[in-house]
Amino acid sequence: SEVEYRAEVGQNAYLPCFYTPAAPGNLVPVCWGKGACPVFECGNVVLRTDERDVNYWTSRYWLNGDFRKGDVSLTIENVTLADSGIYCCRIQIPGIMNDEKFNLKLVIKPAKVTPAPTRQRDFTAAFPRMLTTRGHGPAETQTLGSLPDINLTQISTLANELRDSRLANDLRDSGATIRIG
């Protein structure tokens, strides 16, 4: 099943996807597509990278993070209701059937006419810079700058933990983004 992310009409949506390059600058091709990941590539490609650079993109879709460090999270600018749906992030790791694929579900909500002031933001639209975890002994806090190197399995595990409603209550709004896939 897909991980769900949310954004409001008119906002930018953020769909996280990561990998750890084997060595700095040793990149692998990545594609983003609208629709669930098929057997090969991405259907309806909106953005693509090779080992050096972004080599294909369409308007409103871009990589805001440092893709040279493996942050291939997709930003969709000024979303509309039509942007709702499944997106595929495919990390085309060389070798036989090595590529990693992630299906992410984007839910677009109508814009609020009069947004009520609130300290808490929908954590699936924008993760804060600081994440406090609990439920596993003493609370520990990690800033973005001190996050350890993590592999795809750890990313997936962390994403699952973030979806836990207990953790959602600990997310504080500081206007930055934890980039996890």
């Epitope: 490609v45 693509r48 085309q92």
Partner: antibody
Amino acid sequence: EVQLVESGGGLVRPGGSLKLSCVVSGFTFSDYGMHWVPQAPEKGLDWIAYISGGSISSGSSTIYYADTVKGRFTISRDNAKNTLFLQMTSLRSEDTAMYYCARHDWRGLYAMDYWGQGTSVTVSS
Amino acid sequence: QIVLTQSPAIMSASPGKKVTLTCSASSSVSSSYLYWYQQKPGSSPKLWIYSTSNLASGVPARFSGSGSGTSYSLTISSMEAEDAASYFCLQWSSYPPTFGGGTKLEIK
């Protein structure tokens, strides 16, 4: 004009080997994934191998095989020569078919949009 | 793997008649990744319909495609002699990609 031209087919004994080639023109070969699809006489189509494009070097491709050819067939590409290969070993009579190469168009139609004319492989003693 | 079953295996139709070919999947297929190919004797396959309902370049408007889940179809609104060929469906939603066994369409 997009063109794909296969070669290398022929008659081979069971257990033997063949190397098929597919030379392409009319598009930027390195940008596109490529497939091999055999068609047994009077039968349907049967996908067997895929190699991804979008890589600068030929060695950094993602590869997929059908279970029926895993360990026996090897797909590869030489981007500098605009050529796709299929190395076939331990050939069996059931490998007898017309072998087509096909382009995987991720930009527009997202699948096997152009096919070669095929090269015939017969495995028989 | 997903098995695609095409029916009928062989059919003949008179010019001007409506023709419907079906492709049934053993489990659900994303409509984005269900394709149809046309093949004439001695020729290689040609992409005919992509993503269930989109006609490939040069395909006459009398052709259409529809379906979802496990049931897909290709329809010719008015059969013409040049439509006589074999038609294969393909899914590449799930590994491995699979083709249907084909329908051979003949002109009466």
